[in-house]
């Protein structure tokens, strides 16, 4: 059997303060059963970033439609960017359990802030 | 056209052991996960099992006896059935998972169920 | 794990007329629910799913709502064919899968 992959394919990323960036991350398969989350940072002090069942991320949403069915596009979009939210943010597929179990982490994207043009 | 059908039920003694089989076609049975559905005479559905990629899950009612497995190379599921008892007599249906991404699974296909009664 | 309660078990409605099926979540589900249909001898066909979105080739006098713990499936105008048990469905929080009891819906 092929081996799941979590894909980020832009390594690096680079936002004005105050517009938004889009983090992407394609997963090779619908299986093993088990949720995505985005995480800023790696290690056991990551923040999290986007996980659908719990928690508030006013700021972040899906990219592609939550309700399709089958979809394998897990890419976020972060709104309002400021140089806080610089750093490296990784998609992480988990295995469905009691807890979940960390499968597999992208490879990483680094969110770059420029300044605001003037 | 998806299409799945089920084999194997039958009459089976308390304590026996049946081994239920899923053939699957017209989708890429592979890539989704599968789970057993059962029904009682006259009742509602309960939920059995369902195996992803060799990641598998039970209803606490037939954990350690029932297991679930798949193979690819053939399209078809299968639900080992130990240690039997009357309350496990009912329709047996497979059902190709579908998801909602960032979310959980529903089912979209079903197959016709397969009988299984456990009587002495 | 999360029980659903369908209300009511059973409905007596006359064709032509609007149905409204119940289901009552034990804790909050979002939008992770999906409702089935199955005439007597039959499998369960998928109806709805996502709480609201109807699958493909269920006809349009279907539909879903409700989020949270309170959900209703509505049934237009009833046609004959629709007369048929119907079970609510959470897939938020698993393992279990849980359904509901079940909705009869009978002719009047």
């Known amino acids: 059997e092929e081996e799941l992959q979590v894909i980020q394919p832009e390594k690096s990323v680079s936002v004005a303060a105050g517009d938004s960036a889009t983090l992407n991350c394609t997963v090779s398969s619908l299986i093993p059963v088990g949720p995505i989350q985005w995480f800023r940072g790696a290690g056991p002090g990551r923040e999290l970033i986007y996980n659908l069942k719990e928690g508030h991320f006013p700021r972040v949403t899906p990219v592609s439609d939550p309700t399709k069915r089958n979809n394998m596009d897990f890419s976020i979009r972060i709104s309002n960017i400021t140089p806080a939210d610089a750093g490296t943010y990784y998609c992480v597929k988990f295995r469905k359990g009691s807890p979940d179990v960390e499968l597999k982490s992208g490879a990483g994207t680094e969110l770059s802030v420029r300044a605001k043009p003037s | 056209e998806v299409q799945l059908l089920e084999s194997g039920g039958g009459v089976v003694q308390p304590g026996g052991s049946l081994r239920l089989s899923c053939a699957a076609s017209g989708f890429s049975f592979s890539n989704f996960a599968m789970t057993w559905v059962r029904q009682a005479p006259g009742k509602g559905l309960e939920w059995v099992s369902t195996i992803g990629s060799g990641d598998t899950y039970y209803a606490d009612s037939v954990k350690g006896r029932f297991t679930i497995s798949r193979d690819n190379s053939k399209n078809t599921l299968y639900l080992q059935m130990n240690s039997l008892r009357a309350e496990d007599t009912a329709v047996y249906y497979c059902?190709?998972?579908?998801?909602?991404?960032?979310?959980?699974?529903?089912?979209?296909?079903w197959g016709q169920g397969t009988l299984v009664t456990v009587s002495s | 794990e999360i029980v659903l309660t369908q209300s009511p078990a059973t409905l007596s409605v006359s064709p032509g007329e609007r149905a409204t099926l119940s289901c009552r979540a034990s804790?909050?589900?979002?939008?992770?629910l999906a409702w089935y249909q199955q005439k007597p001898g039959q499998a369960p066909r998928l109806l709805i799913y996502a709480a609201r979105i109807r699958e493909t080739g269920i006809p349009a006098r279907f539909s879903g709502s409700g989020s949270g713990t309170e959900f209703t499936l509505t049934i237009s105008s009833l046609q004959s064919e629709d007369f048929a048990v119907y079970y609510c469905?959470?897939?938020?929080?698993?393992?279990?899968?849980?359904f509901g009891g079940g909705t009869k819906v009978e002719i009047k």
């Open positions: 469905q959470q897939y938020y929080d698993w393992p279990p899968f849980t």
């Open positions: 059902a190709k998972d579908s998801t909602v991404s960032w979310s959980g699974d529903f089912f979209d296909y």
């Open positions: 804790q909050n589900v979002k939008n992770d």
